[in-house]
Structure formats: C-alpha cells, structure tokens
C-alpha cells in the first residue's frame, strides 16, 4: 500500500532570464527512493539515480543544473518555459509517486515567489 505523499513548491513564478529551483519532497513512507525523474510534458529533463547520480538530458544540458538535493535548477528562463513540471519518484517497494509544479515565466520584474526557491 502506498502511504507516501509528495510536497512540491506548487505554483511558482519567475522572471524571464532568471533562474528557479524546482523542489519536491516525498514523506510519510519508508520506501526506498531508487530514482527521481524530472519531466516537462513528454520531455525528460533529468534523472537522479540513487546509485549512479545525475543525468541531464542533452536537450537541456545548457540550462538545467542538478540539485539542490533531488531538486532541479532551471536557468536562463524564457516565456516558453511556462508550464507544468513533474517530479516522478520511483520507489521500492511502493512504486511511483508524482508531484506537479506549475511555473509561470513573466516578462516583467513583478514575478513573486518564495525566496528560498529563487537563485539570486
């Protein structure tokens, strides 16, 4: 039985040209996290494997950085980066947990988001 829950940064916004950290946290389960996949629609952004470390998809290598922790940092944001992002936690023995984050990239300097998820 899957007892875990994923907490995410929820709906966030950031300025065009800036950076943002996408964070998820799996709690309320003793399941072992074997891998975390970060995705945007049908695109795989990155994989964090518990044994093998990080793989950033080549399409995103120039603007995506691993971490902090199991999170993902998006850099040089454009308005095209607006949309849904998913963290997929592959766990044993529970199976798969999915978290959703909506990112809005704003043209102006009025972007508001939690400071702890922003890269200065």
């Amino acid at each position: 039985m899957m007892t875990g829950t994923i907490e995410t940064t929820g709906n966030i916004s950031a300025e065009k040209g800036g950076s943002i950290i996408l964070q998820c946290h799996l709690s309320s389960t003793t399941a072992q996290v074997t891998q975390v996949n970060w995705e945007q629609q049908d695109q795989l952004l990155a994989i964090c494997n518990a044994d093998l470390g990080w793989h950033i998809s080549p399409s995103f290598k120039d603007r995506v950085a691993p971490g902090p922790g199991l999170g993902l940092t998006l850099q040089s944001l454009t308005v095209n980066d607006t949309g849904e992002y998913f963290c997929i936690y592959h766990t044993y023995p529970d199976g798969t947990y999915t978290g959703r984050i909506f990112l809005e990239v704003l043209e102006s300097s009025v972007a508001e988001h939690g400071a702890r998820f922003q890269i200065p």
Epitope: L44, I47, H55
Partner: antibody, heavy 120, light 107 residues
Framework: EVQLQESGPGLVKPSETLSLTCAVS????????WNWIRQPPGKKLEYIGY???????YYNPSLKSRVTISRDTSKNQFSLKLSSVTAADTAVYYC??????????????WGQGTTVTVSS | DIVMTQTPLSLSVTPGQPASISCKAS??????VAWYQQKPGQSPQLMIY???YRYTGVPDRFSGSGSGTDFTLKISRVEAEDVGVYYC?????????FGGGTKVEIK
C-alpha cells in the same frame, strides 16, 4: 580506449553457480557503472544488473534472488555470480560500461560476449 | 517491467534506399530511449541515445526520433556495412529493457 573482456567457463551444470569475470582496461572501474547483460538464444537482450562507481549494486528483480555482482578494484575487474542455474540461463553474457552522466542508461562500451551453456 | 516492441522483425533494403525501424514502449518513457546496432559476430554498439542524439562516430545517415511511446530509427541511405540487428532500449526506469531486435539485410 575502454576495453572489456569476459572470461569464465562456457559450460555449467544445472543447479550449479555460473561465475564470470570482466577485466577492464583503459578506464578505472571506480568511475561510472559496470553492467552485465545477457541474450538467450532467439530472445531479447536482458539487463542483469550493475555495480556502481561506489560499489552499490542493482539487480533485475527477475533475477535478484540468484545474482551477485562484485568487484576487485585492485585488479580493475568485476564479476557476476548466478546461482541455481537452469537451461533457461543459457545465453551470451556481455559485460558493459555505462556513463550515466552523459548517456543515461544507454550502454556505450560492451565486451565481446561469452557464451555460457547450462547442460549436464 | 516496460515492454519494448519492435517492428518489423526483419527488413530487406536496396543499397542507397532508406530504412525505418519502429519501437513501441508499453508505457510513456518520454525520451529515455537508446538504439544499438549489432553487426554479425560482434557485440551491440550504441548508435542513438536520448531518442534522437547520435553517439560519437555514428554516421549522420542514422537518425532517431520520437517521444512518449513511439520511436523510430531511420537510415537515410542504407549501405552494405549497415547489415545487422538493431535494438531499442528504454532507460526511463529500471529494470532497463530492450526490444526484440530488427534484422536489416541488403537486397
């Protein structure tokens, strides 16, 4: 250049343990991931498991109860043990390297393969 | 486990003509797909990773495409040296799994 060479008996009796070694040259096994993959005659390639740069192991759940992958860093080699073999374990066994950071789970260097037959 | 299904099983192509191999995943694997070529008597060789990126030294007549569940390996102009078996593989989640292979022959 990375080179991998499998060695071990070509014939194993049913219920015994299959033991293979992969000697690696041109690269240290304390980097990247070191894998075993097999191909039974007329069947798909089957992923057996890996030992990571840090010595952590992953085994395909379908074989997990029978498989052990270990390494000897002083000899720059890693090994496969598969216990309680049956005719279904007859296959070409490949050792291989995987550079997870650059290529994800895509295997970039393979040994030439060694044929193991399980028969009395 | 994710099942990778390749079609066709075999393919006979005239030199200089194109060839196309399909691979279908039993669930969404995004772009975590690789393609390998196995020439007769040799071990598999990585051709494509991340669905569409050519590995070092792979001729540009080879291309990969697709995302989600449907993937394609194309050879724009088949040459005699391209004979062999081609395999797809998913690495979206463990256990990493392979397709059954497509044998490419020359007419």
């Amino acid at each position: 250049e990375v080179q991998l060479q499998e060695s071990g008996p070509g014939l194993v009796k049913p219920s015994e343990t299959l033991s293979l070694t992969c000697a690696v040259s041109g690269y240290s096994i304390t980097s990247d991931s070191w894998n075993w993959i097999r191909q039974p005659p007329g069947k798909k390639l089957e992923y057996i498991g890996y030992i990571s740069y840090s010595g952590n192991t992953y085994y395909n759940p379908s074989l997990k109860s029978r498989v052990t992958i270990s390494r000897d860093t002083s000899k720059n080699q890693f090994s496969l043990k598969l216990s309680s073999v049956t005719a279904a374990d007859t296959a070409v066994y490949y050792c291989a390297r995987l550079d997870f950071s650059n290529y994800g789970g895509a295997v970039d260097y393979w040994g030439q393969g060694t044929t193991v037959t399980v028969s009395s | 486990d994710i099942v990778m299904t390749q079609t066709p099983l075999s393919l006979s192509v005239t030199p200089g003509q194109p060839a196309s191999i399909s691979c279908k995943a039993s669930q969404n694997v995004r772009t975590a797909v690789a393609w390998y070529q196995q020439k007769p008597g040799q071990s598999p060789q990585l051709m494509i990773y991340s669905a569409s990126y050519r590995y070092t030294g792979v001729p540009d007549r080879f291309s990969g495409s697709g995302s989600g569940t449907d993937f394609t390996l194309k050879i724009s102009r088949v040459e005699a040296e391209d004979v062999g078996v081609y395999y797809c593989q998913q690495y979206y989640t463990t256990p990493w799994t392979f397709g059954g292979g497509t044998k490419v022959e020359i007419k």
